[in-house]
Interface confidence: low
């Protein structure tokens, strides 16, 4: 029985030329995470897998960095980069948990950044 | 109990260098990455440079070519080098990590660098 939850940034906006973070947490469940797939529509972005640590998809290379956690934070946006982003976390033994975020990338200077984070 | 420590902050004029260093400690087992991030007073945190732990490294745009981030994988420790400061860079210095692998991260309580004639 899947008893987990993802909560995600949920619908963000970013400005174009700009950096966004993109983050999901998996809670309520004990199942371990095996590895998490970060997608933008159909087009794999980002692996960090429980062995062999981050896998960056070679065309996405020089605009997604790794993190915070198992984040993911993608600069130089433009306007193609508006759509929808999904973190699928691959778990033992529920199965696979999958969040989805929405981001806007915006022409003006008025984006609301979504992905805000406290300093403890 | 996960501890991030960053030194190396200051005041530098325009054009000068300064290289941070994040030591981290407490670790169930190595992070996977260290990254830093900054923030100017009355602006919102950016993210400034990533390294993997197999020293693939990225950095925002405003500081390509100036900055250069690396990590020491067996002291858990990450770099910073700041070279051709400009006034825009003045922000307080937070380093992150991840716990190994997990969801949790943590930040350090950060370094001031001020970049003023």
């Known amino acids: 029985m899947m008893t987990g939850t993802i909560e995600t940034t949920g619908n963000i906006s970013a400005e174009k030329g700009g950096s966004i973070i993109l983050q999901c947490h998996l809670s309520s469940t004990t199942a371990q995470v095996t590895q998490v797939n970060w997608e933008q529509q159909d087009q794999l972005l980002a692996i960090c897998n429980a062995d062999l640590g981050w896998h960056i998809s070679p065309s996405f290379k020089d605009r997604v960095a790794p993190g915070p956690g198992l984040g993911l934070t993608l600069q130089s946006l433009t306007v193609n980069d508006t759509g929808e982003y999904f973190c699928i976390y691959h778990t033992y033994p529920d199965g696979t948990y999958t969040g989805r975020i929405f981001l806007e990338v915006l022409e003006s200077s008025v984006a609301e950044h979504g992905a805000r984070f406290q300093i403890p | 109990e996960v501890q991030l420590v960053e030194s190396g902050g200051g005041l530098v004029q325009p054009g000068g260098s300064l290289r941070l260093s994040c030591a981290a400690s407490?670790?169930?087992?190595?992070?996977?990455?260290m990254g830093w991030f900054r923030q100017a007073p009355g602006k919102e945190r950016e993210w400034v440079a990533s390294v993997l732990r197999g020293g693939y490294t990225w950095y925002a745009d405003s500081v390509k070519g100036r900055f250069t981030i690396s990590a020491d994988n067996s002291k858990n420790t990450a770099y910073l080098q700041m070279n051709s400061l400009k006034p825009e860079d003045t922000a307080v210095y937070y380093c992150?990590?991840?716990?190994?692998?997990?969801?949790?991260?943590?930040w350090g309580q950060g370094t001031l660098v001020t970049v003023s004639s």
């Open positions: 992150t990590t991840d716990r190994g692998y997990n969801w949790n991260y943590d």
């Open positions: 407490g670790f169930t087992f190595s992070p996977s990455w």
